[in-house]
């Protein structure tokens, strides 16, 4: 953790990406027993609170404003040296969000990936952002940064994520920035959950009263498994968002969730997945697809009494 070569190591908790009005702890890790440190900002928009101040252990900076965005270094206390201070630490870039309208974030071909697959996360905006940043929730290192490509009044950047593995699953957000203020980022895009599938055994999916029903008849899809999944996710081919329900232990020692689809209006192909509360972005193999057919006069949509999950939230715990 030490910077080596008499250099301290400067880090930020919980993240280097901080919302306007938020707080961030800057920690200067130097030699054991030498806890005092000095902070300074490299650019010209100095933060006056640092001038001549000595901090211990960590410094909580905030509420942050756009002026706090920039590159920081620290020096550790070194009483017996000529200057009394160590060499400067690594540079640490603090980015302040909420300074422009949020961009949009999409996954191509989609947010569900098998191990080893690659996904393109496209961040785009009709704000002419110069740079786009992609950040994964809960990660303290710097976000990935790409130059925006501008075409037809839209600026966009394509981030390649993969080959997919456990460590890459999670909630992603992207941000944009303009040239003269590269670390004053936009508001975050809506969160996008990237899910890794295929790591556990597949559940089974069945329909009550059956896979072929009369128009207007109530249909329930049941997802079940001998594995003690906490949550089941039901997806319909051609629909962007899945529904999810908590699994319920049954007397036959299976774990099941019943998804009421309401009165049947038209059919579709359904799949379900299981996941555990501790790893909400890691899903089982897909169940075998279940084709639900509706006889009679189908209308254009199937109303859903089950609340479909929002665009995101998969990777947060279901309480």
């Amino acid at each position: 953790l030490m910077g080596g070569q008499d250099k301290p190591f400067l880090s930020a908790r919980p993240s280097t990406v901080v919302p306007r009005g938020g707080h961030v702890a800057l920690q200067c890790h130097y030699r054991r027993g030498f806890n005092n440190f000095m902070l300074y900002k490299e650019d010209r928009s100095h933060v006056p609170i640092f001038h001549g101040r000595i901090f211990q252990e960590s410094f909580i900076m905030g509420p942050v404003t756009p002026a706090h965005a920039g590159t920081y270094r620290c020096r550790g206390s070194r009483p017996h040296s000529l200057t009394g201070w160590s060499a400067p630490s690594n540079p640490l870039v603090i980015m302040v969000t909420g300074n422009h309208r949020k961009p949009s974030l999409l996954a191509h071909p989609g947010p569900l990936l098998k191990s080893g697959e690659t996904v393109i996360l496209q961040c785009w905006s009709d704000v002419m952002f110069e740079h786009f940043f992609l950040h994964r929730e809960g990660i303290s290192e710097d976000p990935s940064r790409l130059v925006g490509q501008i075409h037809d009044g839209v600026s966009k950047a394509n981030f390649s994520i993969g080959p997919m593995m456990l460590a890459l699953a999670g909630t992603y957000r992207c941000y944009g920035s303009v040239p003269h203020s590269p670390y004053q980022l936009s508001a975050p895009s809506d969160p996008l959950d990237i899910v890794i599938t295929g790591l556990y055994e597949k559940p089974s999916l069945s329909a009550q009263p059956g896979p072929t029903v009369q128009a207007g008849e109530n249909v329930t899809l049941s997802c079940s498994s001998w594995s003690s999944y906490d949550i089941y996710h039901l997806s319909r081919e051609g629909e962007a968002h899945e529904r999810r329900l908590r699994a319920v232990p049954k007397v036959n020692r299976t774990f099941q969730a019943d998804f009421p689809l309401g009165p049947a209006t038209h059919g579709g192909t359904y799949r379900c997945f299981g996941s555990f509360r501790a790893l909400p972005c890691v899903w089982s193999n897909s169940s075998d697809p279940l084709l639900v057919s509706v006889t009679g006069n189908p209308s254009s949509s199937w109303p859903s009494p089950t609340e479909p999950s929002s665009k995101s939230g998969i990777c947060r715990h279901l309480h």
Epitope: R20, P66, G98, N99, H100, R101, D126, V127, M128, E130, V178, P179, H180, S181
Partner: antibody, heavy 115, light 107 residues
Framework: QIQLVQSGPELKNPGETVKISCKAS????????MNWVKQAPGKGLKWMGW????????TYADDFKGRFAFSLETSASTAYLQINNLKNEDTATYFC????????WGQGTLVTVST | DIKMTQSPSSMYASLGERVTITCKAS??????LSWFQLKPGKSPKTLIY???RLVDGVPSRFSGSGSGQDFSLTISSLECEDMGIYYC?????????FGGGTTLEIK
């Protein structure tokens, strides 16, 4: 199409206040910061600063701190430049221009300060 | 502040001639440079951004080049309507700064 339409010419006495408007159309107003640029008679262009139309935060160049104020009326897609305690050297054409590289400009507002 | 030095300050050129105006920044500004055309009584017109990107609707005879500190605007074949004053602008760092301008007149 994108347009920035500025208010008309102003003739003022020293010590008075002037407020220039810049009405934007053809794009989402809060997408682009608004810059203000001064051109004194026979002189070049001078960047005065910008206002973040998303947050409302103004940034002023050193020569324009104090008597100058940028403001917004977001609902009307309009940015304003106010100059207080006018001086003779404020006589100039003032332009609004939107976006990080000043992509589109208003037609300019001539402010004449004279006794 | 970054100083932008533009040259020449004025020039005469003939119709059909190739014209080049240069702009030098006092420090590296990446490619964050725009070029503008000013004509009396008209709104300034943005020609180029990010050093070499042509703004929609600007004739293809205009082109920009350069990166770092040295930049140029070229008009491949001068037309009558191209007379005016040309300015460069760095937008890499606040405060933005303009070059001193180049007055282009037809011989």
């Amino acid at each position: 199409q994108i347009q920035l339409v500025q208010s008309g010419p102003e003739l003022k006495n020293p010590g008075e206040t002037v407020k220039i408007s810049c009405k934007a159309s053809g794009y989402i107003f809060t997408n682009y910061g608004m810059n203000w640029v001064k051109q004194a008679p026979g002189k070049g262009l001078k960047w005065m600063g910008w206002i973040n139309t998303y947050t409302g935060e103004p940034t002023y160049a050193d020569d324009f701190k104090g008597r100058f104020a940028f403001s917004l009326e977001t609902s009307a897609s309009t940015a304003y430049l106010q100059i207080n305690n006018l001086k003779n050297e404020d006589t100039a054409t003032y332009f609004c221009a939107h976006g990080p590289w000043l992509a589109y400009w208003g037609q300019g507002t001539l402010v004449t300060v004279s006794t | 502040d970054i100083k932008m030095t533009q040259s020449p300050s004025s020039m005469y050129a003939s119709l059909g001639e190739r014209v080049t105006i240069t702009c030098k920044a006092s420090q590296d500004i990446n490619s964050y440079l725009s070029w503008f055309q000013l004509k009396p009584g008209k709104s300034p017109k943005t020609l180029i951004y990010r050093a070499n990107r042509l703004v929609d609707g600007v004739p293809s005879r205009f082109s920009g080049s350069g990166s770092g500190q040295d930049f140029s605007l070229t008009i491949s074949s001068l037309e009558c309507e191209d007379m005016g004053i040309y300015y460069c602008l760095q937008y890499d760092e606040l405060p933005y700064t303009f070059g001193g301008g180049t007055t282009l007149e037809i011989k």
